[in-house]
């Protein structure tokens, strides 16, 4: 009679993570008598997956009833496959021996490859806010996928970005892989409502890529422009001066009025108006009692936006003569003071 052969008909099996893998194995003879064992890997470090004779293998079930005397089908099913299960599985026939069974013949092996979906991409931006016209870095990470081939794209508001670098790790063979990409994004003044999107395509996703997003509202700081304007006289001795704070984001803003360098009032922006581009406008006013001042008054609108160093705009108020006309100081934003006389 021809010597027993162990046949593993499948050179490779591809299974999606979470599914069940069937590893086929048949013997050509009932002789010699002895059990079958399944191993992952070969050599002394191989890992026992299933032993027909003894042991507890909760994830493994046999395809046929191995207790039947004439059974020559030693195929197994492994449930709930993860990328860690990838490897080459060997079906090995043992000959009954004393005290131990002796390995008799091994199958050629079946390589189990696990298709694992990438995790949802996580996009993160810079540690601190940045202002328009600056280039900032965004990172995108996704983990746990297999096989290694993967495609990653970046978009800003639907427009594909080209300035990015992507790495898939590890470089060599592995049970699963991770992708890390860094994109450079130029911020514009209109980006409060913008989004940066990282899109990952993989064979496991059936053409429906995963997306991670970052809202640029979390990244951008649009600094305000200031305009101090004197309003027409409300009463004989009162002058109304307004400070227009325009086109800022985020909303966090504190305004301080100074009269000749002394704090007159401090307030926090609350009832702001929102512009179409997502930035905010706010106006504060100061009623100055001219008769209370003997000399000229320098009024300063000082704004601290989003914890940044204060910027200010000043306006000189002449008290020696009654105001005749509306003055305007339209310079946008300054850290100094305006020495022009408005009257």
């Amino acid at each position: 009679e021809e010597e027993l052969q162990v046949i593993q008909p499948d050179k490779s099996v591809l299974v999606a993570a979470g599914e069940t893998a069937t590893l086929r194995c048949t013997a050509t003879s009932l002789i010699p008598v002895g059990p079958i064992q399944w191993f992952r890997g070969a050599g002394p470090g191989r890992e026992l997956i299933y032993n027909q004779k003894e042991g507890h293998f909760p994830r493994v079930t046999t395809v046929s009833d191995l207790t039947k005397r004439n059974n020559m089908d030693f195929s197994i099913r492994i449930g709930n496959i993860t990328p860690a299960d990838a490897g080459t599985y060997y079906c090995v026939k043992f000959r009954k021996g004393s005290p131990d069974d002796v390995e008799f013949k091994s199958g050629a092996g079946t390589e189990l490859s696990v298709r694992a979906k990438p995790s949802a991409p996580v996009v993160s931006g810079p540690a601190a806010r940045a202002t328009p016209q600056h280039t900032v870095s965004f990172t995108c990470e996704s983990h746990g996928f297999s096989p290694r081939d993967i495609t990653l794209k970046w978009f800003k508001n639907g427009n594909e970005l080209s300035d990015f670098q992507t790495n898939v790790d590890p470089v060599g063979e592995s049970v699963s892989y991770s992708i890390h990409s860094t994109a450079k994004v130029v911020l514009t003044r209109e980006d409060v409502h913008s989004q940066v999107i990282c899109e990952v395509a993989h064979v496991t996703l059936q053409g429906d890529p995963l997306r991670g997003t970052a809202n640029l509202s979390e990244t951008i700081r649009v600094p305000p422009t200031l305009e101090v304007t004197q309003q027409p006289v409300r009463a004989e001795n009162q002058v109304n001066v307004t400070c227009q704070v325009r086109k800022f984001y985020p909303q966090r803003l504190q305004l301080t009025w100074l009269e000749n360098g002394n704090v007159s009032r401090t307030e926090t922006a609350s009832t702001v108006t929102e512009n179409k581009d997502g930035t905010y406008n706010w106006m504060s006013w100061l009623l100055v009692n001219v008769s209370a001042h003997r000399d000229d008054v320098k009024l300063t609108c000082q704004v601290e936006h989003d914890g940044q160093p204060a910027v200010s705009k000043s306006h000189d108020l002449k008290v020696s003569a009654h105001p005749k006309e509306q003055g305007s100081n339209t310079a946008a934003e300054n850290t100094g003071s305006n020495e022009r006389n408005i009257y």
Partner: antibody
Framework: EVQLQESGAELVRPGASVKLSCKAL????????IHWVKETPVYGLEWIGD????????ANNQKFKGKATLTADKSSNTAYMELSSLTSEDSAVYYC????????????WGQGTSVTVSS | DIQMTQSSSSFSGSLGDRLTINCKAS??????VAWYQQKPGNAPRLLIS???SLETGVLSRFSGSGSGKDYTLSINGLQAEDVATYYC?????????FGGGTKLEIK
Amino acid sequence: EVQLQESGAELVRPGASVKLSCKALGYTFTDYEIHWVKETPVYGLEWIGDIHPGSGGTANNQKFKGKATLTADKSSNTAYMELSSLTSEDSAVYYCTRAVSGYYAMDYWGQGTSVTVSS
Amino acid sequence: DIQMTQSSSSFSGSLGDRLTINCKASEDIYDRVAWYQQKPGNAPRLLISGTASLETGVLSRFSGSGSGKDYTLSINGLQAEDVATYYCQQYWTTPWTFGGGTKLEIK
């Protein structure tokens, strides 16, 4: 007192690289941008670019793309500009300056670093 | 890039004169203009930002004005220590750009 301390004068060979440093003192380094400006007799003052140490954000003059690389080390409150593939055209005085983040003028300037490219 | 044009590269004035230095931008820069003074061998010094605001410590004989594309630096009562080169600079759009400078001399 706000100060920007720049590294000393450099004499370098054509084709080489040089890394200039700018140490910020007297203010919170991560709250302000550091800008770099080139001065030559022919072109006057030219803005190279800036870096915001807090966000890592940079803005650059396309004219200096591939020539100047801006970095910042928050732990030492120092900004750096590396100039590569130097030619005689890169001989100049380079200034680091400070500006409030956003659209603000450069309110403090370093003393300048003279770079001479010569064989 | 926005071009900043200073109409005169040099200017000669007498002590006590009032003089103006003009700067024209190639497009609207929304008051984001600064003026710097540079004395020989020194770094530039910020005099005025946001068109008209004097920096702390800058004497009030310096003033700035303008809007849109046209901006002016005025010195009222020229002093010997004002001998320097004056630059305008826009900081509305990157790349920030400077004017070519106006060298001021005393007659």
